[in-house]
């Protein structure tokens, strides 16, 4: 099971309205350039065999690669909405940094890496979906860890 | 091309079952769910619930629980919702819509199916 | 269950006109809403999602606006093709909810 009270983020980190939109807009910018809108990383696959406890620790592996391996790498882009957004990404990423699940967390792991697969496969066009996710990633983590 | 093909009108007696089928064709089936929304004459929408075709997992509104089941058979890429003791006000038309079931819309609907529930 | 409050519910307009229509959530929804186009003995079609993302192949003239709880549905200069009922719809919670519908006739 989670170390529950470790895997949580304060509501408030949803309820401000100004970075929230800046989230959605850089999704909105992102996503007009995905073609490719038969796949989805984050979704019912993501989630499946995974209980409701354990989603939070999920959606910060999840989180946490989207920062390394995406935002980081294609920083420059999307202005100005990139500049306002990787920041607080980056802080409720390390508000989740001591989130941790006791015992074995394979089956999280194994949807985590078909997400992985799944971007790095598309090359460039996965890292511009992931992007466009990024409504879907602020939704999961408020969902999962609030 | 992407689309969804339902069964043909039904005609019930009250308390009986209908069953309609959503054939779905033109895209990878088990990578969206399906939703069922109903329009009764001259009214609005109302969703009724939604099947993973992934997964098979299910959610009602409350107010078909336990009186529908959506089920799904990946072998043929058809959907299916069965509503039991039918009463005249749920003379309907019926359409299956494609979704993923998390923030999605429905961006394609089948044809509609009617079912009329008289005595 | 969110309620969904669509406004007007008929609108008579002309050929040319610049049409609104507004819809109000009960509660917050970010960006999850949708709008369809309904027209007599037809199936819903997608017009916009995610508040203010055109469907594909849906003509520019229609725009979609709005996030929380008060979105509108634009269209810039009616068209005849364009007279039907409009629904919005929220995804942002379950159940699915619609609003009442929006029925565009001519004036």
């Known amino acids: 099971a989670p170390i529950s009270s470790h895997c949580r983020l304060d509501k408030s980190n949803f309820q401000q309205p100004y970075i929230t939109n800046r989230t959605f807009m850089l999704a909105k910018e992102a996503s007009l350039a995905d073609n490719n809108t038969d796949v989805r990383l984050i979704g019912e696959k993501l989630f499946h065999g995974v209980s409701m406890s354990e989603r939070c620790y999920l959606m910060k592996q999840v989180l946490n690669f989207t920062l390394e391996e995406v935002l980081f790498p294609q920083s420059d882009r999307f202005q100005p909405y990139m500049q306002e957004v990787v920041p607080f990404l980056a802080r409720l990423s390390n508000r989740l940094s001591t989130c941790h699940i006791e015992g074995d967390d394979l089956h999280i792991q194994r949807n985590v890496q078909k997400l992985k697969d799944t971007v790095k496969k598309l090359g460039e066009s996965g890292e511009i979906k992931a992007i466009g996710e990024l409504d879907l990633l602020f939704m999961s983590l408020r969902n999962a860890c609030i | 091309q992407v689309q969804l093909v339902q069964s043909g009108a039904e005609v019930k007696k009250p308390g009986a079952s209908v069953k309609v089928s959503c054939k779905a064709s033109?895209?990878?089936?088990?990578?969206?769910?399906i939703s069922w929304v109903r329009q009764a004459p001259g009214q609005g929408l109302e969703w009724m619930g939604w099947?993973?075709?992934?997964?098979?997992?299910?959610n009602y509104a409350q107010k078909f629980q336990g009186r529908v089941t959506m089920t799904t058979d990946t072998s043929t890429s058809t959907a299916y919702m069965e509503l039991r003791s039918l009463r005249s006000d749920d003379t309907a038309v019926y359409y299956c819509?494609?979704?993923?079931?998390?923030?999605?819309?429905?961006?394609?609907w089948g044809q509609g199916t009617l079912v009329t529930v008289s005595s | 269950d969110i309620q969904m409050t669509q406004s007007p519910s008929t609108l008579s307009a002309s050929v040319g006109d610049r049409v609104t229509i507004t819809c109000r959530a009960s509660?917050?929804?970010?960006?999850?809403l949708a709008w369809y186009q309904q027209k007599p003995g037809k199936a819903p079609k997608l017009l916009i999602y995610?508040?203010?993302s055109l469907a594909s192949g849906v003509p520019s003239r229609f725009s979609g606006s709005g996030s929380g709880t008060e979105f509108t549905l634009t269209i810039s200069s009616l068209q005849p093709d364009d007279f039907a009922t409009y629904y919005c719809q929220q995804y942002s919670n379950y159940p699915l909810t619609f609003g009442g519908g929006t029925k565009v006739e001519i004036k």
């Open positions: 509660e917050g929804i970010y960006h999850w």
């Open positions: 099947i993973s075709a992934y997964t098979g997992n299910t």
């Open positions: 819509a494609r979704d993923r079931g998390y923030y999605d819309a429905f961006d394609i």
């Open positions: 995610k508040a203010s």
């Open positions: 033109g895209y990878t089936f088990t990578s969206y769910g």
